[in-house]
């Protein structure tokens, strides 16, 4: 007669994490007498997965009905699969004895677990940088299996090419992590820009995961200053304005200096936003010319986002007629409080 064979028809089985895995096993004979057991791995360190007699195997159920006579189907189902369940499973026939002895093993079924990568987390530099500088962004995703994965970087929909990616560990593992670093050159128009890390994996069925970083959290656009002088109705008064243009973020403090002495300090509040996300602001001084015998040097000094101050000066000539100095085009500005100097 033919000797009993243990048949594991599936060389490999791939299951998504959280699902159940069915591991098939049939025997060709009811004899010799003795139990079937399932193990993960081979050799002395193998792990018992199911034994009908002793042990507690809450995630394992037998596929054949518990009342089936002359059963030769010893398939099992393992519920709630996790990446830690990956490995090769063996259906093993034992010969009854004291103790039972291994009679024959199936060829094994390799269980691979498809685990989705975690949502990519994109992080930028700790400190803000100014346009023309190159900054690094990192993207991390964890817990995926199998190891094959594709990562792409985009800036405003345009694919980036300057990046380096590592998948760890290099060898076999139950699950993997990906880490990528991309270099991005900032421009003045990047306040509204986004950097996107896109991860594609077999478990995502063509719908990649994305992580984003807003460059508004990374960029600092320093302001440009312009100080101008316009006459006002009263013949002895001039309005001096400081136009602070194209800055980001909004955090800005302006100080007026009169001949080097602090005249007024104020914080940008009512700003106007440009289409590119940067801000404009204007502050003015109302200067009483008749109170001065000598020329006055007015300085607009701006401290932006904690950076060293930048300034722009304007020489107010008291001998000249006010109406001949500067232009009268500041009507649109909603600047700050007026200040008279006497």
């Amino acid at each position: 007669e033919e000797e009993l064979q243990v048949i594991q028809p599936d060389k490999s089985v791939s299951v998504a994490a959280g699902e159940s895995a069915i591991l098939h096993c049939t025997v060709t004979s009811l004899i010799p007498v003795g139990p079937i057991q399932w193990f993960r791995g081979a050799g002395p360190a193998r792990e018992l997965i199911y034994n009908q007699k002793e042990g507690h195997f809450p995630r394992v159920t037998t596929v054949s009905e518990s009342t089936k006579r002359e059963n030769m189907d010893f398939s099992i189902s393992i519920s709630n699969i996790t990446p830690a369940d990956a490995g090769t499973y063996y259906c093993v026939k034992f010969r009854k004895g004291s103790p039972d002895t291994e009679f024959k093993s199936g060829a094994g079924t390799e269980l691979s677990v498809r685990a989705k990568p975690s949502a990519p987390v994109v992080s930028g530099p700790a400190a803000r940088a100014t346009p023309q500088h190159t900054v690094s962004f990192t993207c991390e995703s964890h817990g995926f299996s199998p190891r094959d994965i594709t990562l792409k970087w985009f800036k405003n929909g345009n694919e980036l090419s300057d990046f380096q990616t590592n998948v760890d560990p290099v060898g076999e593992s139950v699950s993997y992590s990906i880490h990528s670093t991309a270099k991005v050159v900032l421009t003045r128009e990047d306040v509204h820009s986004q950097v996107i890390c896109e991860v594609a994996h077999v478990t995502l069925q063509g719908d990649p995961l994305r992580g984003t970083a807003n460059l508004s959290e990374t960029i600092r656009v320093p302001p440009t200053l312009e100080v101008t002088q316009q006459p006002v109705r009263a013949e002895n008064q001039v309005n001096v304005t400081c136009q602070v243009r194209k800055f980001y973020p909004q955090r800005l403090q302006l100080t007026w200096l009169e001949n080097g002495n602090v005249s007024r300090t104020e914080t940008a509040s009512t700003v106007t936003e440009n289409k590119d996300g940067t801000y404009n602001w204007m502050s003015w001084l109302l200067v009483n010319v008749s109170a001065h015998r000598d020329d006055v040097k007015l300085t607009c000094q701006v401290e932006h986002d904690g950076q060293p101050a930048v300034s722009k000066s304007h020489d107010l000539k008291v001998s000249a007629h006010p109406k001949e100095q500067g232009s009268n085009t500041a009507a649109e500005n909603t600047g700050s409080n007026e200040r008279n100097i006497y």
Partner: antibody
């Protein structure tokens, strides 16, 4: 399924007997087979089971009885040596059955053959 | 070895009445228990396996229950052919297969 025992009789203590069980109506070589005995007025006692090459014995008969099978003849045997008075019983041949992953029970029995060990 | 204890040893019942008898195992045998009927002068006959599954051809008046260490065989309405000896057998841990001492059901 039919199981028919033969070979019983009267034998002196220390003597030998060979019981046979002719099986029909099922695929004999695919199943384990068992001998169960019942002393007069007593309950059932398992004696021995054979699978393919694997054999199992009750402690009370180990070393004295030998179970064997000839699949070509669909026949089960029990060679009984060094017989004792306490071996006196009706010997039943039974076909093993299993359910799912569990052990064996006996779904078909022969009519039995009486073995009497007496001087 | 697992010891099976059947009680009562003898049960006197009138035809048509219900008969219930038990089999207690010395250790957990899960559901690996069978019941046999032996009429006088006949070979045993399988009635129940896996503690509760009726063998093909066995009347519905026979039912098995229990698991672990406590098992019961119930005959709902005794017929004349049901007066016999009933044995339980465990096949959870062997060798040896062990049988209970039997319960004799006799006519009251």
């Amino acid at each position: 399924v039919q199981l028919l025992e033969s070979g019983g009789g009267v034998v002196q203590p220390g003597g030998s007997l060979r019981l046979s069980c002719a099986a029909s109506g099922f695929s004999f070589s695919n199943f384990a087979m068992t001998w169960v005995r019942q002393a007069p007025g007593e309950g059932l006692e398992w004696v021995s089971t054979i699978g393919s090459g694997d054999t199992y014995y009750a402690d009370s008969v180990k070393g004295r009885f030998t179970i064997s099978r000839d699949n070509s003849k669909n026949t089960l045997y029990l060679q009984m040596n060094s017989l004792r008075a306490e071996d006196t019983a009706v010997y039943y041949c039974a076909k093993d059955s299993t359910v799912s992953w569990s052990g064996d029970f006996f779904d078909y029995w022969g009519l039995g053959t009486l073995v009497t060990v007496s001087s | 070895e697992i010891v099976l204890t059947q009680s009562p040893a003898t049960l006197s019942v009138s035809p048509g009445e219900r008969a219930t008898f038990s089999c207690r195992a010395s250790q957990n045998v899960k559901n690996d228990l069978a019941w046999y009927q032996q009429r006088p002068g006949q070979a045993p006959r399988l009635l129940i396996y896996a503690a509760r599954i009726r063998e093909t051809g066995i009347p519905e008046r026979f039912s098995g229950s229990g698991s672990g260490t406590e098992f019961t065989l119930t005959i709902t309405s005794l017929q004349s052919e049901d007066f016999a000896v009933y044995y339980c057998q465990q096949y959870y841990d062997w060798p040896p297969f062990t049988f209970g001492g039997g319960t004799k059901v006799e006519i009251k």
